[in-house]
């Protein structure tokens, strides 16, 4: 399935809106600097597009819920938010009709499915730190820019696999 | 491609101030905080302070509080650095630089550095 | 502030040497340490982040490893271009501070 050219504009988009949403500086909030554990190797092992679309959607599916929250909408200026939701909700799209295109394959190989997981399981420890920080304004900053480091990685591996074939 | 350009040499006499200025072109200059970093002949590096160009907040090395001042201009993407009382041991290469958008603190941009010389 | 100490501060080796560059925090940075490689004249230029993550453009013989206290910049096998001056710079708390340096020059 190829992904249209929109798609790789559409997150140069999103990456453009997460600095812009950007509120205080990282420089304010050296003592809540955390390490999430993005499982960079979770993209970086799947050697077939059909294997990567669905954990890049994952990945989005996830970034989407995050800032769905209310308390992600209490946290960032509403007008860049509603601009994030609908790149993102293109890009789920996009990357759904490849997964639709790619259902022939009936079984799921389990290498999916665990990064899949490894991904789940990142977002879970996003969500508990926000939690433990009670969303404060230098842990909403963290995060954004942490979702700033982990979708520009994975958007690498985008373009790194389009540049391959 | 995000671009650091500094002003050129300046010498200046002892007690005076300096302002040495850093113009950011090829990117969006409020997303990255600008850091003032010196070099004396010779010598390591020293770590004068940073500005967050989008609100102007400031964190001084003890070292130069009362002494420095970094402020911004966003209309022409400038960010300034000027340090009063002058002594000699203020002769040294100072430069901008700045870090990425998720770790700001480890620099990858740097300007070509400013000598500042200060002699009587 | 913390200090930052570097070890050796000179050495001279040969093209293809292997060359190992230590740097000490004077209390625990976890992995918030860089490493940086500045020739004569020249701004310095960012080579390791993190303690281990290499900088992009950076070419692989460079490496880094070590937490805490106590950190190592490895130099696989020495090329011409790497004749330069290696600073070590944590990035853990206000004011960041800077190793000496390591000279590292033609044996």
């Known amino acids: 399935c190829d992904l249209p050219q929109t798609h790789s504009l559409g997150s140069r988009r999103t990456l453009m809106l997460l600095a812009q949403m950007r509120r205080i500086s990282l420089f304010s909030c050296l003592k809540d600097r955390h390490d999430f554990g993005f499982p960079q190797e979770e993209f970086g092992n799947q050697f077939q597009k059909a294997e990567t679309i669905p954990v890049l959607h994952e990945m989005i599916q996830q970034i989407f819920n995050l800032f769905s929250t209310k308390d992600s909408s209490a946290a960032w200026d509403e007008t860049l938010l509603d601009k994030f939701y609908t790149e993102l909700y293109q890009q789920l799209n996009d990357l759904e009709a490849c997964v639709i295109q790619g259902v022939g394959v009936t079984e799921t190989p389990l290498m999916k499915e665990d990064s899949i997981l490894a991904v789940r399981k990142y977002f879970q420890r996003i969500t508990l730190y926000l939690k433990e920080k009670k969303y404060s304004p230098c842990a909403w900053e963290v995060v954004r820019a942490e979702i700033m480091r982990s979708f520009s990685l994975s958007t690498n591996l985008q373009e790194s696999l389009r540049s391959k074939e | 491609q995000v671009q650091l350009v500094q002003s050129g040499a300046e010498v200046k006499k002892p007690g005076a101030s300096v302002e040495v200025s850093c113009k950011a072109s090829?990117?969006?200059?409020?997303?990255?905080?600008i850091n003032w970093v010196r070099q004396a002949p010779g010598q390591g590096l020293e770590w004068m302070g940073w500005?967050?160009?989008?609100?102007?907040?400031?964190t001084y090395a003890q070292k130069f509080q009362g002494r420095v001042t970094m402020t911004r201009d966003t209309s022409t993407s400038t960010v300034y650095m000027e340090l009063s009382s002058l002594r000699s041991e203020d002769t040294a290469v100072y430069y901008c630089?700045?870090?990425?958008?998720?770790?700001?603190?480890?620099?990858?941009?740097w300007g070509q550095g400013t000598l500042v010389t200060v002699s009587s | 502030d913390i200090q930052m100490t570097q070890s050796p501060s000179s050495l001279s080796a040969s093209v293809g040497d292997r060359v190992t560059i230590t740097c000490r925090a004077s209390q625990s940075i976890s992995s918030w340490l860089a490493w940086y490689q500045q020739k004569s004249g020249k701004a310095p230029k960012l080579l390791i982040y993190a303690a281990s993550s290499l900088q992009s453009g950076v070419p692989s013989r460079f490496s880094g490893s070590g937490s805490g206290t106590d950190f190592t910049l490895t130099i696989s096998s020495l090329q011409p271009e790497d004749f330069a001056t290696y600073y070590c710079?944590?990035?853990?708390?206000?004011?960041?501070?800077f190793g000496p340096g390591t000279k590292v020059d033609i044996k």
């Open positions: 090829g990117g969006t200059f409020s997303s990255y905080a």
């Open positions: 710079q944590q990035a853990y708390s206000f004011p960041f501070t």
């Open positions: 630089a700045s870090g990425g958008s998720y770790s700001p603190w480890y620099f990858d941009l």
């Open positions: 500005i967050d160009p989008k609100s102007g907040d400031t």
